[in-house]
């Protein structure tokens, strides 16, 4: 199906700056740190290869990665079809993120990885400190009052919350492009619907309290005869592509070896269940703690915050993708109309959730349109 | 220190069945789950079946309808009621227990009871 895997893409075993500067792009790294004590590298590629000379402010454009994911997805293609490099390149200052857990995001001023505290967050913490924190340090660093917010997957999900809680931050924002949107996951087909079947007493026994490990628990959705072949062998047991599904169809193969040397970059076992939460409630809603006792402490009410998506006035433009296992069109179907300020919308018939960051074709289908949306945002 | 202990296990005929137990000694008076989980020469290690302290029960899909787990709190027990059994049943059967406390989980395994199903 997808021929051998070669193991020969250098990008393997670098980090983040490594895999730009292989390229022969300008990359700076900084370290972020949040108001509870999360240490978060920060990428920049100031400007593209060919541009160095152009003088003046260039506009910002911060790439914000999924569940289960990092920095690297923004550049783990050929430039000619990476958003990152694609951006640099057409003139823009380029800023990669990393949520807290994920393999370039695991230090703490105050807790080891190795403790449980550490891991005691989910995607609210990453909408309340690492999206702030983040945008505070760019737009402080660049002296640019506003930047562009690219979102993907779980990136648009800390978007929708951070900038519809947080005013002043959704201010800095001048358009948010929401690659795979997810708010709610009532309608999602993805394998992350199976860990709803898991009670929440159960929850930690089966996948511990720190770093999400799912081992071979998926195995038993999984149809033996479609893993058993070389290469699906290796996506079947990722937990990123296990839980977000993949497609042959659109992938560069011989740049697989990147995505699974990268992938999945780790999140907490609370984040997972957070997820698997919305998965039963059906809603977008805060982290719940388990008992109104809890929620009293945390929210001060016994049901845990819902979250008003049309709260958030920010300028956005929306792709999804009609194959799409985790960010299900008829989930999308339900935020469209409760963005008050949707300014583009286009569902790719054929993508699938991974398709938005990977796809040979994104470019033409996807980051094209970015770009030009950009520029337009210029005049 | 806490030590698991199993029994039950042996070599059955395709369809039979069995009934696994595992007892915790020692000093824990905490414990939240129970469980059941198994490897089969040559692969990883899986999950078979769940229990909290409350009775809510989990399954994998490989032994739902065949295989029943319970406890016994007084007597810090989990059993493995396994019915209709299959020949890729045959495994070391391991129990584990744990204590959720407010600084993290503490484990505990049993060493393991061989099942072995013939067909």
């Known amino acids: 199906l997808f021929g051998k895997l070669h193991p020969g893409s250098p990008e393997v075993t670098m980090n983040i700056s490594q895999m730009i500067t292989y390229w022969g792009y300008p990359n700076e790294e900084y370290e972020v740190v949040t108001e509870d004590g999360y240490i978060l590298e920060v990428n920049r590629i100031p400007y593209g290869k060919k541009n160095s000379g152009n003088t003046g402010q260039r506009p910002v454009v911060f790439l914000q990665h999924g569940l289960l994911a990092s920095a690297t997805n923004w550049i783990s293609n050929l430039p000619n079809n990476s958003l990152a490099f694609i951006l640099a390149d057409a003139g823009y200052d380029v800023w990669l993120g990393n949520s807290r857990g994920n393999t370039w995001a695991r230090r703490n001023l105050y807790y080891s990885p190795d403790s449980v505290e550490f891991w005691a967050f989910s995607f609210d913490e990453m909408a309340k400190y690492d999206l702030p924190a983040t945008i505070d340090f760019i737009v402080k660093k660049t002296g640019q009052k506003q930047l562009h917010y690219v979102g993907h997957s779980q990136g648009t999900t800390i978007g929708f919350i951070a900038f519809s809680t947080n005013p002043s931050l959704a201010k800095r924002i001048k358009t948010f492009y929401a690659l795979a949107p997810v708010a709610t996951v009532k309608y999602t087909k993805s394998l992350i619907n199976k860990l709803r079947f898991v009670p929440q007493s159960l929850f930690k026994f089966i996948f511990g309290d720190k770093i999400f490990y799912p081992h071979n628990f998926f195995d038993q959705f999984l149809a033996t005869e479609v893993c058993s072949r070389e290469m699906l062998n290796l996506l079947c047991s990722n937990a990123l592509f296990i839980i977000c599904g993949f497609d042959s169809k659109n992938f560069n193969t011989s740049r697989l070896d990147v995505y699974l040397s990268h992938n999945p970059a780790g999140t907490s076992v609370q984040n997972m269940f957070h997820w698997t939460q919305a998965v039963k409630s059906g809603k977008f809603q805060a982290y719940d703690w388990g008992s109104p006792v809890q929620n009293r402490m945390h929210y001060d009410q016994s049901q845990p915050p819902y979250y008003n998506v049309t709260a958030m006035n920010v300028p956005i433009a929306v792709w999804n993708g009609g194959k799409d296992l985790l960010a299900d069109p008829q989930d999308v179907g339900l935020l469209l109309p409760k963005l008050p300020n949707l300014i583009y919308h286009k569902e790719i018939p054929f993508y699938n959730h991974l398709d938005f960051i990977w796809a040979m074709d994104a470019p033409q289908e996807v980051y094209n349109d970015i770009v030009s949306m950009i520029s337009e945002d210029k005049k | 220190q806490v030590q698991l202990q199993e029994s039950g296990g042996g070599l059955v005929q395709a369809g039979g069945s069995l009934r696994l137990s595992c007892t915790a000694s020692g000093t824990t008076d905490n414990i939240n789950a129970m469980g059941w989980y198994r490897q089969a020469p040559g692969k990883q290690r899986e999950l078979v079946a769940a229990i909290s302290s409350g009775g809510d029960t989990y399954y994998t899909e490989f032994v739902k309808g065949r295989f029943t787990i319970s406890r016994d709190n007084a007597k810090k027990a989990v059993y493995l009621q396994m019915n209709n059994l299959k020949s890729e049943d045959t495994a070391v059967y391991s129990c584990?227990?744990?204590?959720?406390?407010?600084?993290?989980?503490?484990?505990?395994w049993g060493q393991g009871t061989q099942v072995t199903v013939s067909s």
């Open positions: 584990k227990m744990t204590d959720m406390g407010r600084y993290g989980t503490s484990e505990w």
